[in-house]
């Protein structure tokens, strides 16, 4: 009956500061409305990076000013986080909530360690 959420252990952001990973959940019920939240854990502090609620079969919609985008397919959500810098390196946790119909369930992944390396500035060329 418990909700299980799986996500990759490690992801490396690309040179443009974009990282993508899949968040997959084993649903104990037939949810029609699902909320996905990306949390960042640094030390003992947990902050919300972005969140989206979607109807099963529909696209995932984040707020316009969100640094996240995503697509959904069944019990899988493909998440992309943009605009990352080296200081954003950390553990990113996928949280999935089955909002409707009742009963409510929540599941939390073990987290994806995202490594971000700032690109070296291009040398001036004469």
């Amino acid at each position: 009956k418990a909700m299980h959420v799986a996500q990759p252990a490690v992801v490396l952001a690309n040179s443009r500061g974009t990282a993508s990973f899949v968040c997959e959940y084993a649903s104990p019920g037939k949810a029609t409305e699902v909320r996905v939240t990306v949390l960042r854990q640094a030390d003992s502090q947990v902050t919300e990076v972005c969140a989206a609620t979607y109807m099963m079969g529909n696209e995932l919609t984040f707020l316009d000013d969100s640094i996240c985008t995503g697509t959904s397919s069944g019990n899988q959500v493909n998440l992309t986080i943009q605009g990352l810098r080296a200081m954003d390196t950390g553990l990113y946790i996928c949280k999935v909530e089955l909002m409707y119909p009742p009963p409510y369930y929540m599941g939390i992944g073990n987290g994806t360690q995202i490594y971000v390396i700032d690109p070296e500035p291009c040398p001036d060329s004469d």
């Epitope: 009956k1 418990a2 909700m3 947990v46 409707y100 929540m106 599941g107």
Partner: antibody
Amino acid sequence: QVQLVESGGGVVQPGRSLRLSCAASGFTFSSYGIHWVRQAPGKGLEWVAVIWYDGSNKYYADSVKGRFTISRDNSKNTLYLQMNSLRAEDTAVYYCARGSLLGPFDYWGQGTLVTVSS
Amino acid sequence: DIQMTQSPSSLSASVGDRVTITCRASQGISNYLAWYQQKPGKVPKLLIYAASTLQSGVPSRFSGSGSGTDFTLTISSLQPEDVATYYCQNYNSAPWTFGQGTKVEIK
């Protein structure tokens, strides 16, 4: 620092109504789900209700469903519990508690006592 | 609904003793379990979440273990300030049920 302060408790007759408030400070209230939990004198903790960060979802314990209504005003950083058709068994200290982003209740108010008696 | 059952309902131990409280869920809740401490006349305080993760500021003598349906809270060396009632809680699904509590006293 995070603070939750309940108010509105008191003595009320069976069948009457009461509205509890929970004033929040020290965190972004509109980002968190908030719960009501009660504790009858000398008894254990009983979860009562929850409201989502934006008020979009609400859940209730079977024991209060249809009688209690949870609501919030994010512009005032305040949570409410409207309690109607009160019964003697609703006598308890009522706590508001913040649902942390990871799920458990990480901050609790000091509680307000509701006594239902004729 | 998921029922949470704690045992024992009360215990008495000496300062320095190792104390163990168990909590059983009526169905599997993975590791979505929290432990709270409530000292006499005080507000409940979160001790442990995710079955075994210590909340910031909680002394290391407290530890939690378990997954699925069976969970344990251990106090490795009981201190006078640990006199309290301890509650487990499911937060995997609604309703957010609590165990009935375990009262810990000093001999």
